[in-house]
């Protein structure tokens, strides 16, 4: 089973950006994290990015005021991924 983040939190929220913070997992099998942003109630991410396994902070920019966003971080290993850790925030 691919380890899942448990301490994802929001920091530095503005009307157009949201900062994410988490503790990078201590496992040599993890190759990175995928960050996805979905407007709540919509289908596919309006934003996706990949960061290295050592990264524990990310700022999502270009968001629109007054929209609820479901923001997920997924742990990636070779050949698999974790369940998403998801938080919802309105800008």
């Amino acid at each position: 089973e691919v380890p899942q983040l448990t301490d994802l939190s929001f920091v530095d929220i503005t009307d157009s950006s949201i900062g994410l913070r988490w503790t990078p997992l201590n496992s040599s099998t993890i190759i990175g994290y995928r960050i996805t942003v979905v407007a709540a109630g919509e289908g596919i991410p309006i934003f996706e990015d990949f960061v290295d396994s050592s990264v524990g902070y990310y700022t999502v920019t270009g968001l629109e005021p007054g929209i609820d966003y479901d923001i997920s971080v997924i742990t990636l290993i070779n050949g698999g991924e974790s369940a998403p850790t998801t938080l919802t925030q309105q800008t």
Epitope: E42, I44, E48
Partner: antibody, heavy 116, light 112 residues
Framework: QVQLVESGGGLVQPGGSLRLSCAAS????????MHWVRQAPGKGLEWVSV????????YYADSVKGRFTISRDNSKNTLYLQMNSLRAEDTAVYYC?????????WGQGTLVTVSS | DIALTQPASVSGSPGQSITISCTGT?????????VSWYQQHPGKAPKLMIY???KRPSGVSNRFSGSKSGNTASLTISGLQAEDEADYYC???????????FGGGTKLTVLG
């Protein structure tokens, strides 16, 4: 300016195949999900398929599942729709559209006619 | 799966206001959260008019507004103008069926 241009439509026999392309310009194509939407002559809009910016998320309408394949080449700023086992009911104008919150940019469409 | 139901046609006179409804029904009782609205003139590509229930893209007249109550979304056009005559479609994400869905479309006729 932001633009989507579809191509690849035409006349094809039932059971045949066709590949549609959608060339994007004026924006960072690799940052956006993309849709295919079709409209049969005199009918309403029907969503066909979507692919997320990285290709990690792909969904299809039930009516095309198993026959159509959506893909993208971010290095070429191009979206594709591979259509196999075509049926008469697939006859339509096919539009590509950019995914934001809502489908905010549309191409002019390309006509696909399936007939013997 | 969700089906979005719109009236086939509505009409109004120049200067009047009209409202087009979009009702979501689902076999499992589920609904939809957000909705977008599109305008399509004959022979043209659709144009996004409203997204996320009530938000207007830049460049769209403030005569167009959106709202939602329960499983029914509405598009209201105030101060009707001749160029508003077109087909209008609502669209939503069906989280149960994992697909996007369009309503059947509403033909708006501006009288006179």
């Amino acid at each position: 300016q932001v633009q989507l241009v579809e191509s690849g439509g035409g006349l094809v026999q039932p059971g045949g195949s066709l590949r549609l392309s959608c060339a994007a310009s004026g924006f960072t194509f690799s940052s956006y999900g993309m849709h295919w939407v079709r409209q049969a002559p005199g009918k309403g809009l029907e969503w066909v398929s979507v692919i997320s910016s990285s290709g990690s998320y792909i969904y299809y309408a039930d009516s095309v599942k198993g026959r159509f394949t959506i893909s993208r080449d971010n290095s070429k700023n191009t979206l594709y729709l591979q259509m196999n086992s075509l049926r008469a009911e697939d006859t339509a104008v096919y539009y590509c559209a950019r995914n934001k919150v809502g489908f905010d940019v549309w191409g002019q469409g390309t006509l696909v006619t399936v007939s013997s | 799966d969700i089906a979005l139901t719109q009236p086939a046609s509505v009409s109004g006179s120049p200067g009047q206001s009209i409202t087009i409804s979009c009702t979501g029904t689902s076999s499992d009782g589920g609904g939809y959260n957000t909705v977008s609205w599109y305008q399509q003139h004959p022979g043209k590509a659709p144009k996004l008019m409203i997204y996320y229930v009530h938000k207007r893209p830049s460049g769209v007249s403030n005569r167009f507004s959106g709202s939602k109550s329960g499983n029914t979304a509405s598009l209201t056009i105030s101060g009707l103008q001749a160029e508003d005559e077109a087909d209008y479609y609502c669209q939503a994400w069906d989280n149960q069926g994992m697909k996007y869905v369009f309503g059947g479309g509403t033909k708006l006729t501006v009288l006179g």
